[in-house]
């Protein structure tokens, strides 16, 4: 066994950048650092077979599967799949190690196998074996967090039954409003499950996996603030575990906090309370109100009372399936080509929503915003004064919701214009749809001012991709018309547009554009 | 079905007095909090007094001292008594219980 080379398995990731896709170099793009595969002797095997470790690849990931060789002397090698021989071309590196590499572009199912790497040096020959298999994404969940109390312990547990395993975290943050966007500085994250300090104004638990991310923010009721005009709700399915935070600050401790549902107060068993004095000596009360498992009959009125702050109340309500709520009627707006406009979804849902905004069969982003009224609202801005049909989609794990909107530009027509042997066509999409005269010039009209009403047909079309409507207008060529120039003209409300047009014998068309 | 109703809105002088009242039908009325609110024109409404069904109030501050809360749970009537009106005042009260709300009364200080 002296004779065996030192063997190195690496698997590299590489990040796509669209440059590189499609040429296949030995390093085609930026790349994670390697990721040691081992490659240990394969026992009972005839022969000396090294194994990698199995290596799991999203679809479309692009990675090189790479054997470094510690052994004197020069190398040869050949890489066997699925019974086909692929070219193998060994380089040394600076420390003089045999490199050997296999790149796979955009992984697909067809690329998933065992990849056989046959190496002979100048001592020995070996072969190293790779299975790659695509990860099974399908089976990926990302659910959003829950809290359970921690037993004995006055902390909350976030919980979030996810595959992978998620990473949690908390995202704590101590001032009001708007300070506490995600990338303030007020913002404190906690990579940890339990979480001990409570008394923060905002709270909320993250989980991320390779799905994404997914928050649930503990809902507080704060009766230092002054009573909000709108009652807070909260929506939970039936069987969700239901927190809510009542917090008060007050001079001294001479004050108590209580939770009642409808009048009635709550059981012990579903509430906890916890006090600190804050830095400037004043006494911190929270009180919690759980249910682990919610039922319909824990639909109501929660109210938080104090001796020394004004009630304040929030309406839990306990649905059987989650919904999306709002209008989806169609939705036609006209602007001009200069104006300021945004299109808005304003929608009550629960779990919250993942939606997204198409403009001509290509995707947006789609951000929410929380407003007062329980209701929240998206916005989309960045159609950069393209007309035509865009659609708002929302779903959640119960719900689907689609909307459409319709954009037009009111803009003065433009006009193209075509001619084939019998007929010409001109073309415009301004907006409101113009109307269309055609005239014809000679020599007793030079300005073509003669009017033609024969044989003109005119008819609005969608033009598919954008969803906008296009006019158009076509002339059936008569003997009358035929070798003069004739003039059709497009106008609305924001002007009027024209092209000239020689109607001669077949062949390539002179157009004139004349506005 | 629960509904509020405001009365005892009008015109007064500045330094003036007025009493307003919020009736309540449809709901168990004494074992409920009440709070009035106030919207003055071009203005978000904004929260003014809270009586608890333990008799406690609480005031905003720009009416603490001139304003005070009262509740008769015989009549099913919770009162605003507002003394040493200002032009401030100004405003259309509302009461509230829970997610309920009156249709308002307006109150008109002059100066």
């Known amino acids: 066994n002296q004779d065996l080379p030192v063997i190195k398995c690496v698997l590299i990731n590489h990040k796509n950048n669209d440059s590189s896709v499609g040429k296949s170099s030995s390093y085609p793009m930026v790349s994670e650092s390697p990721e040691d595969l081992g490659c240990a002797l394969r026992p009972q095997s005839s022969g000396t077979v090294y194994e990698a470790a199995a290596v799991e690849v999203d679809v479309s990931a692009s990675i090189t599967l790479q054997v470094l060789v510690d052994a004197p002397g020069n190398i040869s090698c050949l890489w066997v799949f699925k019974h086909s021989s692929l070219n193998c071309q060994p380089h040394f590196d600076l420390q003089n190690r045999g490199v050997v590499s296999m790149v796979i572009l955009k992984m697909t199912e067809t690329q998933a196998g065992e990849y056989l790497l046959f190496i002979q040096s100048e001592a020995t020959n070996y072969t190293i074996l790779f299975t790659v298999s695509i990860r099974n994404t399908l089976l990926y969940t990302l659910r959003r967090p829950y809290f359970r109390k921690m037993e004995n312990q006055d902390a909350l547990v976030c919980i979030s039954e996810s595959v992978p395993e998620p990473i949690v975290e908390w995202v704590l943050c101590d001032s009001q409003g708007e300070s506490c966007k995600e990338e303030s500085p007020a913002v404190v994250k906690k990579e940890e499950k339990v979480l001990h300090e409570l008394f923060g104004t905002d709270i909320r638990c993250c989980a991320r996996n390779e799905l994404g991310r997914e928050c649930t923010r503990l809902f507080t009721i704060d009766l230092n603030q002054t009573p909000q005009t709108t009652l807070p709700q909260l929506f939970l399915k039936v069987g969700e575990p239901l927190w809510i935070r009542c917090k008060a600050v007050h001079v001294n401790h001479g004050f108590g906090l209580t939770w009642e549902l409808e009048n009635k107060a709550l059981e012990e068993g579903n509430y906890f309370e916890m006090s600190t004095y804050s830095t400037n000596r004043t006494m911190i009360r929270i009180l919690f109100a759980f249910v682990s498992s919610v039922a319909r009959n824990d639909t109501g009125y929660y109210t938080c009372s104090s001796s020394k702050h004004p009630s304040q109340s929030a309406l839990v309500t306990i649905v059987e399936k989650g919904f999306i709520n709002a209008t989806n009627s169609s939705e036609d707006y006209e602007i001009d080509q200069y104006e300021e406009f945004c299109f808005s979804v304003r929608f009550k849902a629960y779990p919250q929503i993942r939606c997204t905004w198409t403009f001509s069969r290509k995707s947006f982003p789609c951000e929410q915003k929380g407003l007062d009224n329980g209701y929240s609202i998206s916005k989309f801005c960045n159609h950069k004064h393209q007309p035509g049909e865009y659609i708002f989609h929302a779903e959640n794990d119960d719900a689907q919701f689609t909307k459409m909107f319709t954009l037009n530009i009111r803009r003065k027509p433009q006009v193209l214009a075509e001619a084939s042997a019998s007929q010409a066509s001109c073309f415009s999409d301004g907006y409101p749809l113009p109307s269309w005269t055609w005239k014809k010039c000679s020599d007793k009209s030079p300005n073509c001012t003669e009017e033609i009403t024969e044989g003109v047909w005119n008819r609005k079309a969608n033009r598919k991709v954008f969803g906008q409507w296009v006019s158009s207008s076509t002339l059936n060529m008569s003997e009358a018309i035929k070798g003069f120039l004739v003039k059709c003209c497009a106008y609305n409300s924001l002007g009027t547009s024209c092209e000239t047009i020689l109607l001669n014998s077949p062949g390539p068309f002179p157009f004139i554009q004349d506005n | 079905q629960v509904q509020l109703q405001e009365s005892g809105g009008g015109l007064v002088q500045a330094g003036g007095s007025l009493r307003l009242s919020c009736a309540a039908s449809g709901v168990t009325f004494s074992i409920n909090y009440i709070d009035w609110y106030r919207q003055a024109p071009g203005k978000q409404r904004e929260w003014v007094a809270q009586?608890?069904?333990?008799?406690?109030?609480f005031y905003a501050d720009s009416v603490k001292g001139r304003f005070a809360i009262s509740r008769d749970n015989a009549k099913n009537t919770v009162y605003l008594q507002m003394n040493s009106l200002k032009p401030e005042d100004t405003a259309v009260y509302y009461c509230?219980?829970?997610?309920?709300w009156g249709q308002g009364t307006q109150v008109t200080v002059s100066s």
């Open positions: 009586i608890t069904r333990d008799s406690n109030s």
């Open positions: 509230r219980l829970l997610s309920y």
